[in-house]
């Protein structure tokens, strides 16, 4: 069977400051069972906007319901955007493990600018 | 309910070092970016430091850039700042403050670790 | 670097009485926002972000308005409770976290 893939579909999206950005991601495949994280940036600095499994992210609402059986929609949107928002947001797979979920595969990442609210 | 309980303030000479810890209970302290935010007598609130949730991306204010370093061990739930090379204006109460999301304001306050430092 | 102004440094206000203390940013942070209330010998306690939004748990004498670089904190009948500084915080722009340099408010 086909290996899962993580698809961004925009490489850069651009909003005003203040309006919300939708961050597109689908995967191909709901087989490794595992949950959805979004991150800023890459490698040891990233931030972490949205953990599937656990927290409180009151900026950020899913697109589709995540919980509804078969969905591979993982799209989210950030409301309120502000100027140190901009950067690269990276879609990743985890694959359930124990004690820890170990990342899978990471989507190509999206990147957010920030335009000056008009006036 | 959320706690952030400090510990390790004390009274040191210039030049020496000091470790605050935080530990936190209440929320999923590995969702968060926690921060130092310290205050001198009779002044005002000063940042002094971030961590993003996965304990890879730093931030310092320009007056302790080089002498302190935030870590933090999201398996015992515990926030630390190392302080080296103390100095008289370094003398302040500590708090460690969670912050909302990756990009926010400081929603839950530890009661605060004082710091003095004198010869 | 965003710089916060804090006005009046101290207020006096009789209990029952309307406080209102302003915030003004050297530029415009949107509705990024936050007030602090801490009592003496006290850790500071969020009470509005988002410029409007009170915290959980925050009782609603307390509001905040204003959007860009004007913002207010108004306290609408002053219980003796209150007695306290009052820091504005803005996160539109960071690193740094700036903290304005606070009103004090006292009971007449």
């Known amino acids: 069977e086909d290996e899962l893939q993580v698809i961004q579909p925009e490489k850069s999206v651009s909003v005003a400051a203040g309006e919300s950005a939708t961050l597109r991601c689908a995967m191909t495949s709901l087989i490794p069972v595992g949950p959805i994280m979004w991150f800023r940036g890459a490698g040891a600095g990233r931030e972490l906007i949205y953990n599937q499994k656990e927290g409180h992210f009151p900026r950020v609402t899913t697109v589709s319901e995540l919980t509804k059986r078969n969905n591979l929609d993982f799209s989210i949107s950030i409301s309120n955007i502000t100027p140190a928002d901009a950067g690269t947001y990276y879609c990743v797979k985890f694959r359930k493990g124990s004690p820890d979920d170990v990342e899978f595969k990471s989507g190509a990442g999206t990147e957010l600018s920030v335009r000056a609210k008009p006036s | 309910d959320v706690q952030l309980v400090e510990s390790g303030g004390g009274v040191v000479r210039p030049g020496e070092s000091l470790r605050l810890s935080c530990a936190a209970s209440?929320?999923?302290?590995?969702?968060?970016?926690m921060n130092w935010v310290r205050q001198a007598p009779g002044e005002g609130l000063e940042w002094v430091s971030r961590?993003?949730?996965?304990?890879?991306?730093?931030d310092y204010a320009e007056s302790v850039k080089g002498r302190f370093t935030i870590s933090r061990d999201n398996s015992e739930n515990t926030l630390y700042l190392q302080m080296n090379s103390l100095r008289a204006e370094d003398t302040a109460v500590y708090y460690c403050?969670?912050?909302?999301?990756?990009?926010?304001?400081?929603?839950?306050w530890g009661l605060g670790a004082l710091v003095t430092v004198s010869s | 670097e965003t710089v916060l102004t804090q006005s009046p440094a101290t207020l006096s206000v009789s209990p029952g009485e309307r406080a209102t203390l302003s915030c003004r940013a050297s530029q415009t942070v949107g509705s990024k926002l936050a007030w602090h209330q801490q009592k003496p010998g006290q850790a500071p306690r969020l009470l509005i972000y988002?410029?409007?939004n009170r915290a959980t748990g925050i009782p609603d004498r307390f509001s905040g308005s204003g959007s860009g670089t004007d913002f207010t904190l108004t306290i609408s009948s002053l219980q003796t409770e209150d007695s306290a500084v009052y820091y504005c915080q803005q996160y539109y722009y960071w690193p740094p976290y700036r903290f304005g340099g606070g009103t004090k408010v006292e009971i007449k």
């Open positions: 961590i993003n949730s996965g304990g890879g991306g730093t």
């Open positions: 988002d410029a409007t």
């Open positions: 209440g929320f999923s302290f590995s969702s968060y970016a």
């Open positions: 403050a969670k912050q909302y999301d990756w990009n926010g304001f400081f929603d839950y």
